[in-house]
């Protein structure tokens, strides 16, 4: 008699990424066989939830539910029904909850405990939901796109499985932005890692990994820039601001009330003789990656070396992967090419500031203007941040890879998240078995 | 300023197809679903299907899979709504709405002007 | 699918006073401790407005003198004291599972 394969053997697991502007989530499956092996867990599906990020509702907690539906039943059909008891789900939440947090612990418990007792009433095996640390966050990502690559397997190979791929065991330092923080993760060469709380230590499929990370609350693209219109309009002269980072002709008023709503701007917060204020862009890169350098402190470093603000920063050491909104931004940009030099990304950021408003309003038609307008700041921050707040260079530039996906599954903290809730990387390397023989009866 | 503006109204003949439009303005059809519903003259409303921009999945009533696609098209961020194998009963108004939350989490709602359709030999 | 009756079939009202209309849903829209039921006004030769969503909850620049209320199968629209713009065509809508439905309508008269 012919050989009858029988029902696939898998796994599924689902992680809600929580972030500041909007929440993903995101549903995973693996050979259940094969848990500990590397590189077998990857992403069957992403749901954006449509709305902005779960602290924005916190003062209508009750309709978090509402706002989750959609991506949940989204889940539910995705994931076979006879799995949904047995699929765990973790909710993370990043630097947006962090902020509410450093506001009211209280709000932001009461956010979580609604987020909780929503995904209670789902099908799945809910784990929780959680204010993740940046240092969390940092070093999830970077297990993330190691694991995706294929670093953390001994099996040394000949040719190239996935991109950016190197063919040697040296894992990649990761790069992600978000719209409230931003972490730098990777390993150093040689180098002690002089603050304490920068340094973490990994054992991973039998290898020890000494790992640099941090993460800097409030310079997320969202925040910095509103760290830079508190700073800017401190020294306006009235209610009209003309802001560089903006292109020329866009205009848009802002409450002086939200301007200083978030935690990232009470440096700069003062009595101003106006309630609102008016953007007017000038669209002028040089004056906007000027205005957003301020936002740095390099003037202090008790360390060796530094990023900036005073945070113990090791020399970078060998391939980066830039995900999240490094990569989004730069892809709207269309500057993710291995091959564009960081000379040609500066020249092109020139010219995509000083166009019109209305031109560039004709030629995205596709696109939120919020989002649409604030492209400039944003890929101009992205410049100022690798090379003056992280010490990249021209040359070192090419070291960094802008990268949205790995192999199917989209770089950020959330696969590795639920790898290391799951149990699913060993410290030391699995045995290697003889082939399966549970395929086929 | 949020704006959806339909096509034009339409004259079809039994048997034919028609492909109505809905484009937005001051809003990115991405950050939500497209739901087109269906009035006939002097009747009520009726919920023909909805479409996630975002990742092209579609949902519909029944009664209506078959005859009816929707898609979209977010460079342009227009919806579509396309019905074919017409008969005298899909005479009607169409309208494409837009409704979730925002990004300070107000629910809101968009509605296109509607398109008549009315279908004659 | 689900079948949305509403009642009355129609309403006379005078301006100032309270409107109260109902919809039987023929099973229930709760789910995931959510009553996925809308209300939408129309006035003629106007596309539909969203007043309520999800039970109880008023959309946006919404007066307010509606309120939702309800669970299970059976939720109400209540307009405390009738203005004169008020007076038109108000539906119910459930969204808990596709195919979406409607109720066939109310409408509200001046008397």
């Known amino acids: 008699t012919q050989n009858k394969a029988l029902p696939e053997n898998v796994k599924y697991g689902i992680v809600l990424d929580a972030g500041s502007s909007h929440t993903s989530l995101y549903i995973y499956k693996w050979p259940a066989e094969k848990e500990n092996d590397t590189g077998v867990v990857h992403q069957v599906e992403e749901c954006r939830v449509k709305g902005p990020g779960i602290s924005k509702f916190v003062q209508k907690v009750n309709e978090i539910g509402i706002y989750l539906t959609d991506c949940m039943e989204r889940a539910r059909e995705v994931i076979p029904r006879s799995q949904h008891q047995e699929t765990p789900v973790y909710l993370g939440a990043t630097a947006g909850m962090r902020l509410l947090r450093m506001e009211s612990e209280e709000l932001a418990d009461r956010v979580l405990d609604v987020v909780e007792r929503s995904l209670s009433n789902y099908p799945f095996d809910f784990q929780g939901a959680r204010i993740i640390t940046g240092q969390e966050e940092g070093a999830y990502g970077w297990i993330t796109i190691n694991y995706l690559l294929g670093k953390f397997s001994q099996k040394t190979r000949w040719f190239s499985i996935v991109p950016y791929e190197t063919n040697n065991q040296e894992t990649f330092g990761a790069l992600d932005l978000g719209g409230a923080s931003t972490q730098v993760t990777f390993v150093p060469q040689n180098q002690t890692i002089e603050s304490p709380d920068n340094a973490l230590q990994f054992r991973l499929y039998g290898k020890d990994y000494n790992v640099y990370t941090h993460s800097f609350l409030c310079y997320g693209k969202d925040q910095a820039l509103w760290q830079k219109l508190a700073k800017d309009i401190q020294v306006a002269s009235n209610e009209i601001l003309r802001d560089p980072c903006f292109h020329p002709g866009y205009k848009k008023v802002v409450n002086v009330s939200d301007l200083y709503k978030t935690p990232c701007t009470k440096r700069f917060e003062m009595t101003l003789p106006f309630q609102q204020f008016e953007i007017q862009g000038i669209g002028n890169y040089q004056q906007c990656h000027q205005s957003i350098l301020e936002l740095f402190n390099t003037s202090y470093c008790p360390y060796s070396q530094c990023a900036f603000n005073g945070i113990f920063l090791p020399p970078l050491q060998g391939d980066f992967g830039a995900f999240s909104a490094f990569y989004f931004v730069m892809k709207f940009l269309n500057l993710t090419s291995e091959k564009v030099s960081q000379e040609k990304v500066t020249e092109m950021m020139k010219k995509f500031c000083a166009q019109p408003w209305e031109e560039i309003k004709t030629s995205y038609a596709g696109v939120k203007e919020k989002y649409l307008s604030e492209y400039c700041f944003s890929g101009t921050y992205i410049l100022s941040l690798l090379l003056q707040g992280y010490h990249f260079t021209a040359d070192s530039w090419e070291h960094i890879h802008f990268i949205g996906k790995i192999q199917g599954s989209d770089a950020g903290w959330t696969l590795g998240y639920m790898l290391n809730l799951t149990n699913m990387i060993p410290a030391e390397q699995p045995l290697s078995t003889p082939l399966s023989h549970s395929t086929y009866v | 300023q949020v704006q959806l503006v339909q096509s034009g109204a339409e004259l079809v003949k039994p048997g034919a197809s028609v492909k109505l439009s809905c484009k937005a303005s001051?809003?990115?059809?991405?950050?939500?679903?497209v739901h087109w519903v269906k009035q006939a003259p002097g009747k009520g409303l009726e919920w023909i299907g909805k479409?996630?921009?975002?990742?092209?999945?579609?949902k519909f009533d029944p009664k209506f899979q078959g005859r009816v696609t929707i898609t979209a098209d977010t460079s342009t961020n227009t919806a579509y709504l396309q019905l074919s194998s017409l008969r005298s009963e899909d005479t009607a108004v169409y309208y494409c709405?837009?409704?979730?939350?925002?990004?300070?989490?107000?629910?809101?709602?968009?509605w296109g002007q509607g398109t008549l359709v009315t279908v004659s030999s | 699918e689900i079948v949305l009756t509403q009642s009355p079939a129609s309403l006379s009202v005078s301006p100032g006073e309270r409107a109260t209309i109902s919809c039987r849903a023929s099973?229930?829209?709760?789910?995931?401790?959510?009553?996925?039921m809308n209300w939408f006004q129309q006035k003629p030769g106007q596309a539909p407005k969203l007043l309520i969503y999800?039970?109880?909850n008023q959309g946006s620049g919404v007066p307010a003198r509606f309120s939702g209320s309800g669970s299970g199968t059976d939720f109400t629209l209540t307009i405390s004291s009738l203005e004169p713009e008020d007076f038109a065509v108000y539906y119910c809508q459930q969204s808990k599972e596709v195919p979406y439905t409607f109720g066939q309508g109310t409408k509200l008269e001046i008397k």
């Open positions: 709405a837009l409704y979730g939350y925002d990004d300070d989490a107000y629910y809101f709602d968009y």
């Open positions: 001051g809003f990115s059809i991405k950050d939500t679903y």
């Open positions: 099973e229930s829209v709760d789910n995931y401790g959510i009553s996925f």
């Open positions: 999800a039970a109880s």
């Open positions: 479409i996630d921009p975002a990742n092209v999945n579609t």
